[in-house]
Interface confidence: low
């Protein structure tokens, strides 16, 4: 679903898009468009992602800009005023409304913007169990930027005496380049255990662009927990897992 009307009230039924009128062609001069995005449940939150092809006149956002407010109108918490050619980061609402305002002046204009909106999933909703012999595990939204403030648990369950092989095809989390006193990956991180989270042996904590490489688990359970903070977001990760049946005799189960 795509909406390029100049303003609307959108009650989210499924993920969709709203764009500046005419996108990806040039937006119109002297526009003032306002969108209210509403989650169907008052306890749900909304996530918006801007398409990387973002192009609004860049003169300190005085003339053409898009503003995001966390609430039902401009009285909501101000989340940012954006222009230029660099797409804004994802925005997650604190409640069931996001208000978006687009203004253009009477002259210079660009291609505009496209926003993907969806219900924000976190905790149990972004977590998943895997019980098939092979599969792909991806961070939310991959390959687009992952949302902020996530806590996602991924657990692979396979028969006992089987070995899980996990290989990362892509890995890009916010780096932690100057950690104090031995702490590292303070911001966004992926924790991996051979077993259940915080229970089985800890395989490692990963962030930045240093891929975890090839991970092996022989406990029959491999778990990962993906944490993100409230700021900088990256592309995330994509990993393939497969299960090798052990050659150990059934008698030893």
């Amino acid at each position: 679903f795509r909406n390029d009307k100049c303003g609307d009230t959108i009650k989210i039924e499924s993920p969709g898009y709203l764009t500046s009128p005419g996108y990806p062609h040039s937006y119109h001069p002297s526009e003032k468009c306002e969108w209210l995005i509403q989650a169907p449940d008052p306890y749900q939150r909304i996530m918006i992602n801007f398409n990387p092809h973002f192009d609004l006149e860049d003169r300190d956002c005085k003339y053409d800009y898009v503003e995001v407010f966390d609430g039902e109108n401009e009285n909501g918490h101000f989340r940012g005023k954006f222009c230029g050619k660099i797409a804004p980061p994802p925005v997650v609402s604190s409640g069931p409304f996001l208000f978006i305002k687009f203004v253009s002046d009477y002259e210079t204009h660009g291609a505009g913007f496209s926003i993907r909106y969806e219900i924000f999933k976190r905790g149990p909703e972004c977590s998943q169990n895997y019980t098939t012999p092979s599969g792909v595990i991806k961070s939310p939204g991959f390959p687009e930027k992952y949302p902020n403030s996530l806590e996602c648990t991924y657990i692979v369950f396979v028969p006992k005496m089987s070995e899980i092989i996990l290989e990362f095809e892509s890995f890009d989390l916010e780096p932690d380049s100057n950690p104090p006193g031995g702490m590292f990956c303070r911001y966004d991180r992926l924790e991996i255990w051979d077993g259940f989270p915080d229970v089985g042996p800890h395989i490692g904590r990963y962030c930045g662009q240093k891929t975890p490489g090839r991970i092996r688990s022989s406990s029959g359970i491999l778990s990962m927990v993906f944490y993100t903070d409230s700021a900088i977001a990256k592309e995330g990760f994509s990993a393939n897992y497969s299960v090798l049946q052990s050659s150990v005799s059934e008698d030893f189960k």
């Epitope: 905790g123 149990p124 909703e125 169990n129 019980t131 657990i155 259940f196």
Partner: antibody, heavy 115, light 107 residues
Framework: EVQLLESGGGLVKPGGSLRLSCAAS????????MSWVRQAPGKGLEWVSS???????YYAESVKGRFTISRDESKQTLYLQMQSLKTEDTAVYYC?????????WGQGTLVTVSS | DIQMTQSPSSLSASVGDRVTITCRAS??????LNWYQQKPGKAPKLLIY???SLQSGVPSRFSGSGSGTDFTLTISSLQPEDFATYYC?????????FGGGTKVEIK
């Protein structure tokens, strides 16, 4: 040994309030999401609320706006603040650890809402 | 909300019998299905998680199967201590929901 011990139940009038507590021991409390599940007399199990390790909360529709789940890591305790209680809230309330599922349960505390 | 329907609601069986309980979800829940046992006056106990994985310490006579919408709990040889009520529960999405329960009684 994992142990969950609920307290705070009792008799309360409709419209009243009550706070349930669940003291956890035998595991790293901060590493687990926690939940409350209730069971009305002679009935089945009903999920009430959950709280993630980082404090994100989830509620059943029947209790939204009336119940508040919270946790205190320093005390290793889970709470359920119940307000505007109704007769249909009468039940045994269990706290449960969320591991692969509700993998450990307390013994339950009875809440009776009656005039 | 996802509705969980258990059948039968009760059954009578003898020690040594093979017992099968079914649970159906109102929409696909992949393998996000757990089984619990509850005895009178006691808290529920987790038996099976992720549809077919046996919880640590649970006897191997208990097994679970299924995926999508249809799931089964099987007790291969009923023991005296197995007479209880059994519940299925989906953990696919909130609100988390339970089946109505199946009471296994002595014949």
């Amino acid at each position: 040994e994992v142990q969950l011990l609920e307290s705070g139940g009792g008799l309360v009038k409709p419209g009243g309030s009550l706070r349930l507590s669940c003291a956890a021991s035998g595991f790293t409390f901060s590493s687990y999401a926690m939940s409350w599940v209730r069971q009305a007399p002679g009935k089945g199990l009903e999920w009430v609320s959950s709280i993630s390790r980082t404090g994100y909360t989830y509620y059943a529709e029947s209790v939204k706006g009336r119940f508040t789940i919270s946790r205190d890591e320093s005390k290793q305790t889970l709470y359920l603040q119940m307000q505007s209680l109704k007769t249909e809230d009468t039940a045994v309330y269990y706290c449960a650890r969320v591991g692969t599922a509700f993998d450990y349960w307390g013994q339950g505390t009875l809440v009776t809402v009656s005039s | 909300d996802i509705q969980m329907t258990q059948s039968p609601s009760s059954l009578s069986a003898s020690v040594g019998d093979r017992v099968t309980i079914t649970c159906r979800a109102s929409q696909s829940i992949s393998s996000y299905l757990n089984w619990y046992q509850q005895k009178p006056g006691k808290a529920p106990k987790l038996l099976i998680y992720a549809a077919s994985s046996l919880q640590s310490g649970v006897p191997s006579r208990f097994s679970g199967s299924g995926s999508g919408t249809d799931f089964t709990l099987t007790i291969s040889s009923l023991q005296p201590e197995d007479f209880a009520t059994y519940y299925c529960q989906q953990s696919y999405s909130t609100p988390l929901t339970f089946g109505g329960g199946t009471k296994v009684e002595i014949k």
